[in-house]
Structures are given as C-alpha cells and as structure tokens.
C-alpha cells in the first residue's frame, strides 16, 4: 500500500485546468460584485503581453486586506516561475499609470480568456 | 475610469491627409481589440477599422482599403488612423472605441470630427 500510494496521490494540475479554474475565480469575482471591489483600491496597470501572470500578480499582490482577490493572488503564483512580494515593480508595468482593481480585474479576465481559446496554458 | 480622447480631426482638403490619435487611460488597452468608427451627417455609425491587441491582425471596411492605416502603440496606450486621398464622403465624427466581442467591455470616446473639403 504504501507503495502504491503514488499512484493515487494526484499529480501536477494540467496548465489548461489551471487556467480554466483561474478564469473561473474571476468570474466569480466580476459577478458577484457588490461594493466597490477591495474598496475601489487602485493598482499598476500594465502596458504588454510577455509575462503577464508575473506582471498581473506584482500588481494585485500590493493590494492588501482584500479577502475577494486573495484566491486569485494564490492562483497567479502558480503561473509565476519566481517568487512575488509586495513592492515589486516590473517593466511590464506602466509607472504613472493606476487603474481601479475591479477593472484589472475585469481586463485580465477578458485576456486569459482570450488565451484560452488560443490554446496558450502557459 | 476608462477614458478614450480621440484627436488630430480637422478640416482637410480633399486627397489630403489626418493622422487620428486616440490616448487611452483606466484600463488595460493592450489586452483589448480596439477600432475607429465613423458617422458621416444623417447616417448610420459603420466601422471603419479594427485592429487585434497585439496589432497582428487588421480589418479595413472596403471604402478605406488602401488609403486608410490603423495601427497602435500599446507602451503609449495609443490607438492611431493614418488617413490618406481623403474624399469628401470620408467626412465624418471619427470614434475611438474598443472592439471586443465580449459583452460589457464596450467603451467609447466622443468623437473627433473630420471634414473634407476644398
């Protein structure tokens, strides 16, 4: 048994449910929106389309005491080969420019969406 | 919020040229499909151009093809219509606007107008 114990644990979650799962964490979140999301707190907006996942969670991981977008600051880190801490700042980012995080969120869902249906898991 | 500011409309006689600008702010423009749009007095709004997020692919209404050119800048936020061999019947208010099929990511900007005339 406790060889084959490894075999039933599960193994790597395949990219394209990581990413089916993630897109349906942010349509929970767009619809389900009341108040204003994380108090209408303003994040770093980003101006490409290479490393987005890093890019999108050095954003959202500068937004603190925001229990509706934790979940998804969790699933981002999946896709993020290295390791994300507040304060980070990336070229992917647009310095002067902040946007609101219902509508980052709302944009990154209609991007990952778009992959999706390109085929891009990754 | 999300704001589109179109500018660079005027008068223009006819063959000649206008560059469109329009500056984008409040959302993240290089995830949208974005295009121009254009209403000439007394008629219908028509689409005039589209152009992917990446600026890869392009649509051109059959009136411009060959004399119109979109294109964008996604580390400015900018959208752009190069216009040349204007006509009169390009006469129009020019929109900037998103071009997503995806409902509720419809945004507009006021308009910018051009008129061709000699």
């Known amino acids: 048994l406790t060889c084959l114990g490894g075999f039933a644990s599960p193994g790597p979650v395949p990219p394209s449910t990581a990413l089916r799962e993630l897109i349906e964490e942010l349509v929970n979140i767009t619809q389900n929106q009341k108040a204003p999301l994380c108090n209408g707190s303003m994040v770093w907006s980003i101006n490409l389309t290479a490393g987005m996942y890093c890019a999108a969670l050095e954003s959202l991981i500068n937004v603190s005491g925001c229990s509706a977008i934790e979940k998804t600051q969790r699933m981002l880190s999946g896709f993020c080969p290295h390791k994300v801490s507040a304060g980070q700042f990336s070229s992917l980012h647009v310095r002067d420019t902040k946007i609101e995080v219902a509508q980052f969120v709302k944009d990154l869902l209609l991007h990952l969406k778009k992959l999706f249906r390109e085929g891009q898991f990754n | 919020g999300v704001q589109l500011l179109e500018s660079g409309g005027g008068l223009v006689q006819p063959g000649g040229s206008l560059r469109l600008s329009c500056a984008a702010s409040?959302?993240?423009?290089?995830?949208?499909?974005m295009g121009w749009a254009r209403q000439a007095p007394g008629k219908g709004l028509e689409w005039v151009s589209k152009?992917?997020?990446?600026?890869?692919?392009?649509y051109y209404a059959d009136s411009v093809k060959g004399r119109f050119t979109i294109s964008r800048d996604n580390s400015k936020n900018t959208l752009y219509l190069q216009m040349n061999s204007l006509r009169a019947e390009d006469t129009a208010v020019y929109y900037c606007a998103t071009a997503e099929d995806e409902p509720g990511y419809d945004y507009w900007g006021q308009g910018t107008l051009v008129t061709v005339s000699s």
């Open positions: 152009i992917g997020d990446k600026g890869g692919k392009t």
């Open positions: 409040g959302f993240i423009f290089a995830w949208y499909d």
